[in-house]
């Protein structure tokens, strides 16, 4: 190992305060005491250190915890978060949603980086699942969280999470992970009125299977064109003209604008046009009048 | 002697993209945390984006975010800033430095970029 | 965002004059704080960090102060090459905001 310089006479360090600013990096290595720097960690936050200096100050603290710093220091870290690793915070144990909160502060604003990606997964699998108060403060700082999630990772959301997700926490969600969180949701909410509930789970409706969007067609909601696009297709083929008329409400008329787009293209080639016609906007590609339609998935089911 | 030395600027059509790139010497390139910084005509200095000495941490100014994508290449010393969905707005002297965190303590000279149509 | 506001926005002044300029930060910035000198054409120079600190190269002359909102860049002594914009700049939170800058002018 190498022989470490020693600190230089009246310079070593009684308090991490502003002085050390003006320390050269082997003056901090040489005269700042891990110990002090661990007990006093609240306070280097305040003082305007280097890049440079940071990673001697980490550098002493990765000496004193090589198997990992303690909680109280973790939520002291402030801005010297941004220096560690993951392989630093695999060795964590964060149990306090003050203490990632703390971090997450830190972070704010910027890209979601590797560290913070290893910081969520350590906490929440410390926690065994994603309850709704860490969940809340996950998509506070990052609406995109739930959406960067695997199907496999959302199975553990358990239903009562639900309620702190917002529509724009959905936004970059693809049908996979939807197909996840609607039966979760459809559960969540199952004791709201039939208005109330259709606010609440229409962020979700991209998981929705056929019976349930005909169910809702029954009850007046009115959904909007930007929702309806987002149905899954396969969800959508089996609704009749009659239902989509009755789900869509006053918006049906925006179908016109869609009908070369999915599911829109896709469900009027399963219509017959004199159907398609009873709506009046002129949408083409259905079924001739005369045609037979056979299903063959049907008739490859039952041989 | 520490340089950094941008280039890449010039006059692009408003909804255009230009990318900006910055050769450092004279340092350890790699060691560093790295920041754009742009001057419009006559106007204060707006500090746009740093991205950490590996590339793993990265932060934009909410004028750039989403348009703006910083990015380095430490084997070749160069730091980038690729512009897209340019407005009139950018139009401004755009700076590379070298970000030590508390302060920048060295500057290229300037890329001037003019957006117009 | 932290605002940097600078004052005055010029000075005019003479060879040899004492020149102060102020920057107050909206919220408190403990130290976290830089002063830049630019000339026209030019990229700005780094003088002061730390709020107090003078970067290597930089003459004595340069002396900065303050802590929490109110900072202070003194040239104790002005010279003919000091006559430029200076500009402040808080570092204590993101995104990094400067001050619109103090120019300097030959009286």
């Known amino acids: 190992e190498v022989e470490k310089t020693a600190c230089p006479s009246g310079k070593k360090a009684r308090e991490i305060d502003e002085s050390l600013i003006f320390y050269k990096k082997w003056e901090l290595e040489a005269c700042v005491d891990a110990a002090l720097l661990a007990t006093q960690m609240d306070r280097v936050n305040a003082i305007p250190f280097t890049y440079e200096q940071l990673d001697v100050l980490k550098h002493k603290l990765d000496e004193l915890y090589p198997q990992g710093y303690p909680e109280s220091v973790i939520q002291h870290l402030g801005y010297l978060f941004l220096k560690m690793s993951p392989e630093d915070i695999r060795k964590w144990n964060v149990t306090s949603l003050e203490t990632l909160k703390a971090l997450l502060e830190v972070n704010k604003g910027h890209e979601m980086s590797p560290q913070v990606a290893t910081l969520i997964d350590r906490f929440v699998k410390g926690r065994g699942q994603l309850d709704k108060d860490t969940l809340d403060t996950l998509t506070a700082f990052y609406p995109g969280y739930l959406c960067s999630l695997s199907p496999e990772e959302l199975s553990s959301v358990p239903p009562s999470s639900i309620w702190a997700v917002r529509p724009q926490d959905l936004d970059t969600c693809d049908p996979r992970q939807l197909d996840v969180l609607y039966p979760k949701a459809r559960l969540a909410f199952q004791n709201m009125n039939g208005s109330e509930y259709f606010v609440k789970i229409q962020s979700f409706l991209g998981g929705a299977p056929t019976e349930d969007l005909k169910a809702l067609s029954q009850q007046n909601v009115s959904m909007d064109l930007a929702t309806f696009m987002k149905l899954r297709t396969d969800a959508v083929l089996p609704l009749t003209v009659a239902e989509v008329q009755k789900l869509l409400g006053p918006h049906v008329e925006g179908l016109k604008a869609e009908e070369r787009h999915r599911p829109v293209r896709d469900w009027i080639l399963r219509q017959r046009q004199d159907d398609l016609d009873t709506l009046g906007l002129g949408l083409q590609g259905g079924i001739p009048n005369g045609y037979l339609v056979l299903d063959l998935s049907m008739q490859e089911a039952l041989s | 002697q520490v340089q950094l030395v941008e280039s890449g600027g010039g006059l692009v059509k408003p909804g255009g993209s230009l990318r900006l790139s910055c050769a450092a010497s004279?340092?350890?390139?790699?060691?560093?945390?790295m920041t754009w910084i742009r001057q419009a005509p006559g106007k204060c200095l707006e500090w746009l984006s740093y991205?950490?000495?590996?590339?793993?941490?990265?932060y934009y100014a909410d004028s750039v975010k989403g348009r703006f994508t910083i990015s380095r290449d430490n084997a070749k010393n160069s730091l980038f800033l690729q512009m897209n969905s340019l407005r009139a707005e950018d139009t401004a002297v755009y700076y590379c430095a070298r970000d030590r965190n508390s302060h920048f303590d060295y500057w290229g000279q300037g890329t001037l970029v003019t957006v117009s149509s | 965002d932290i605002q940097m506001t600078q004052s005055p926005s010029s000075v005019s002044a003479s060879v040899g004059d004492r020149v102060t300029i102020t920057c107050r930060a909206s919220q408190g910035i403990n130290t976290w704080l830089a002063w830049y000198q630019q000339k026209p054409g030019k990229a700005p120079k780094l003088l002061i960090y730390?709020?107090?600190g003078l970067q290597s190269g930089v003459p004595s002359r340069f002396s900065g102060s303050g802590s929490g909102t109110d900072f202070t860049l003194t040239i104790s002594s002005l010279q003919p090459e000091d006559f430029a914009t200076y500009y402040c700049?808080?570092?204590?939170?993101?995104?990094?905001?400067f001050g619109c800058g103090t120019k300097v002018e030959i009286k």
């Open positions: 700049q808080q570092a204590k939170s993101f995104p990094r905001t």
């Open positions: 991205i950490s000495s590996s590339g793993s941490t990265i």
């Open positions: 730390g709020a107090s």
């Open positions: 004279g340092f350890t390139f790699s060691d560093y945390y």
